[in-house]
Interface confidence: low
């Protein structure tokens, strides 16, 4: 029994004076606590606790369930204990079958013994299955068997406490270990869409998905730069043992322009926190903005191809798109597609493929697009560059030689005289008159130029060349002169 120096309070003394006592089932348990300031006896086993204010604890017919720790406490709060085993061959274990273990921590399989003298106190797997190779345990007859450093893989493990009695193995009732996972990473959070574009009055609803190993993860929707509590609805699922999913849905039934902003879904666990944001933009009405991808004034050579390309933003989605030329709608030769397959995409591309353009196909090509709120259009002015074509070359009754040429850009007409039979006409002749004939006509067609010279200036046989040219190319026509005596006999025009 404990002894202390006089004057100091001392713990109570217990009779019988030993730390452990073994009695047989049916025998009497008689424990005496001696202390001037006796307060109470306390009995503890598993989760059961009993108290007795008498200084003598008497159990007339002991049962296995009387196995446990008996503690006597005095008024100074000092105590002394004795552990009593009630040996019952028919009930070797007391059990509390609830068995929870936190990952990486130790957990106690609560199967204290009623007989400390049995051997090979250990754990065994159910139905003869072996225990996991890495499972370590420490037996304690008074408390049970401590499993060291519980692993996630032990979840749902079926166990028995086991002892050898008279050469035979005896098993306790079965235990099912439930492992509470440790947080070893921050929660995984995702949002149904990264951005939302809505018109006033439409419903805003966004769902945050939080994934973690257990349901004790915390989550909430917050509005950036605001403390206002948002209304959320939750759904949750356990997909297997350590795969928990929660969906937190935030709804604004009728969004307003001032609801625009950034909303954050925040989640945390004991390891750390994670967040994801979504942006809400509320507009008072829909819109369409068109961006030409090439210059809206286009010059293209005769016979060549050109692609008229626009990008446009449309919200809500575009409903009608068309390309128009000269009040006619194209049914083919164009394509229209979203710039991205993202559900939030509002950007689109439209392309009109003009192939082997003719000089007559210049003009205004218009792209029109509409949605349920607005219409928009953009025009491309297409000019087709054409090599000059000499429309007429004549000797007029007044003796003038006249050349009329058409092309785009506007052709220039030069005149040359070639004396005799020379092939090269180098001597230039100044025109008497130059006119642009259709400057008041359509702005995209060929431009027609007329130029005249006085043939009376030519006194010798030879050839007059009318040369029409522009940036694209050149074309010539020729007049042949033949004199007989003093008379001009003939003038033959040819190209």
């Amino acid at each position: 029994q404990p002894s202390v120096s006089p004057g100091e309070p001392s713990p109570p003394s217990i009779h019988p004076g030993k730390s452990d006592l073994i009695v047989r089932v049916g025998d009497e348990i008689r424990l005496l606590c001696t202390d001037p300031g006796f307060v109470k006896w306390t009995f503890e086993i598993l989760d059961e606790t009993n108290e007795n204010k008498q200084n003598e604890w008497i159990t007339e017919k002991a049962e296995a369930t009387n196995t446990g720790k008996y503690t006597c406490t005095n008024k100074h709060g000092l105590s002394n204990s004795i552990y009593v085993f009630v040996r019952d061959p028919a009930k070797l274990f007391l059990v509390d079958r609830s068995l929870y273990g936190k990952e990486d921590n130790d957990t106690l399989v609560r199967c204290p013994l009623t007989d400390p003298e049995v051997t090979n106190y250990s754990l065994k797997g159910c139905q003869g299955k072996p225990l996991p190779k890495d499972l370590r345990f420490i037996p304690d007859p008074k408390a049970g068997i401590m499993i060291k450093s519980v692993k996630r893989a032990y979840h749902r493990l079926c166990l028995h406490c086991s002892v050898d009695q008279e050469g035979k193995s005896v098993l306790s009732e079965k235990f099912i270990l439930k492992v509470r996972p440790a947080f070893k990473a921050v929660p995984v959070v995702s949002v149904s869409k990264a951005s939302y574009l809505l018109r006033e009055g439409e419903e805003f609803t966004v769902t945050c998905t939080i994934k973690d190993v257990s349901s004790s993860v915390y989550s909430t929707w917050k509005r950036e730069n605001s403390q206002t509590k948002l209304q959320e609805k939750y759904n949750s699922w356990h997909h297997g043992d350590f795969n928990y999913e929660r969906q937190a849905t935030l709804t604004i039934s009728s969004a307003r322009v001032n609801d625009s902003g950034v909303f954050m879904c925040y989640a945390n666990n004991t390891f750390g926190s994670a967040n994801v944001t979504t942006t809400l933009e509320v507009v008072d009405k829909g819109f369409i903005n068109i961006f030409p991808m090439i210059n809206t004034t286009v010059f293209v050579n005769d016979g060549e191809n050109v692609d008229l390309i626009v990008e446009y933003e449309a919200f809500p989605k575009p409903e009608h798109q068309q390309w128009i030329y000269m009040n006619r709608t194209f049914t083919d030769k164009w394509e229209d597609y979203p710039k991205s397959e993202n559900e939030s995409n509002i950007r689109y591309v439209s392309e009109l493929h003009l192939t082997r353009l003719k000089g007559t196909e210049g003009g205004t090509y218009t792209f029109l697009v509409s949605n349920s709120d607005v219409n928009a259009a953009i025009a491309f002015n297409v000019y087709v560059n054409t090599k000059p074509e000499i429309l007429t070359y004549d000797r007029l009754v007044n003796g003038m030689l006249q050349c009329v040429a058409a092309g785009f850009p506007e052709p220039t007409i030069d005149w040359y005289f070639c004396p005799g039979t020379e092939q090269r006409c180098s001597a230039s002749v100044l025109p008497v008159d130059v006119q642009t004939l259709n400057s008041s006509g359509p702005p995209f067609g060929k431009l027609v130029v007329q130029s005249s010279i006085d043939s009376s200036a030519f006194k010798h046989n030879g050839t007059v060349e009318c040369k029409a040219y522009n940036d694209v190319g050149k074309t010539s026509a020729y007049f042949n002169f033949a004199f007989k005596g003093n008379n001009k006999e003939q003038i033959h025009p040819h190209t």
Epitope: M293, D307, I309, E311, Q321, D332, W334, E335, D336, Y337, P338, K339, E341, E343, V349, E351, H353
Partner: antibody, heavy 122, light 106 residues
Framework: EVQLVESGGGLVQPGGSLRLSCAAS????????MAWVRDAPGKGLEWVAN????????YYLDSVKGRFTISRDNAKNSLYLQMNSLRAEDTAVYYC???????????????WGQGTTVTVSS | DIQMTQSPSSLSASVGDRVTITCRAS??????LNWYQKKPGKAPKLLIY???RLQSGVPSRFSGSGSGTDFTLTISSLQPEDFATYYC????????FGGGTKVEIK
């Protein structure tokens, strides 16, 4: 799982007709360009036709223009190829393919069906 | 129309070999070139798009290069599952394929 499943192939006489169908699942069909590509014996892969996502614009290989018609039903997630005036040289395995793009007007085929065989023979 | 010419039309190689296939366009197609793998009885599989961008899930031993009219597909170390026919395809407009290159076991 993104999937395209073709059907409607078979044996047909020259001058005859067939209608191929392609059922799409696992993706937003109405947001993608779709195409038909064929693999003819000894000839290799040949693009046949394609259609834009709303179905308003179509393109064809020169040799099938006027004979083949590509169409789609976005409500049914389905693509079709109506083949008329069939010729022996149209014999091939016909694949339905999803067109995806990089940039603006540049396309590649990222998802293909398993193919359906069309044999044109007398 | 843009014509695509592949060379060689077939080649024999061993596992572990470095294999190069070339593709030439009849006119400049910028970087708008794709490569596909085709095995008998199977659907074509996209390997590379935009000349050099590896499609998701395609092993890194496949690579592409080139621009304008001349392009190359390289398999750095041929594996047993790589024996197949490879096609190039221009993706700018009216999507034409090359004639194919059959890679056979030596």
């Amino acid at each position: 799982e993104v999937q395209l499943v073709e059907s409607g192939g078979g044996l047909v006489q020259p001058g005859g007709s067939l209608r191929l169908s392609c059922a799409a699942s696992g993706f937003a069909f109405s947001g993608y360009y779709m195409a038909w590509v064929r693999d003819a014996p000894g000839k290799g892969l040949e693009w046949v036709a394609n259609i834009n996502y709303p179905g308003s614009s179509t393109y064809y290989l020169d040799s099938v223009k006027g004979r083949f018609t590509i169409s789609r039903d976005n409500a049914k997630n389905s693509l079709y190829l109506q083949m008329n005036s069939l010729r022996a040289e149209d014999t091939a395995v016909y694949y339905c393919a999803r067109g995806d793009y990089y940039g603006t007007t540049y396309w590649y085929f990222d998802v293909w069906g398993q193919g359906t065989t069309v044999t044109v023979s007398s | 129309d843009i014509q695509m010419t592949q060379s060689p039309s077939s080649l024999s190689a061993s596992v572990g070999d470095r294999v190069t296939i070339t593709c030439r366009a009849s006119q400049s197609i910028s970087s708008y070139l794709n490569w596909y793998q085709k095995k008998p009885g199977k659907a074509p599989k996209l390997l590379i798009y935009y000349t050099s961008r590896l499609q998701s899930g395609v092993p890194s031993r496949f690579s592409g290069s080139g621009s304008g009219t001349d392009f190359t597909l390289t398999i750095s170390s041929l594996q047993p599952e790589d024996f197949a026919t490879y096609y190039c395809q221009q993706g700018r407009r009216l999507w034409s394929f090359g004639g194919g290159t059959k890679v056979e076991i030596k």
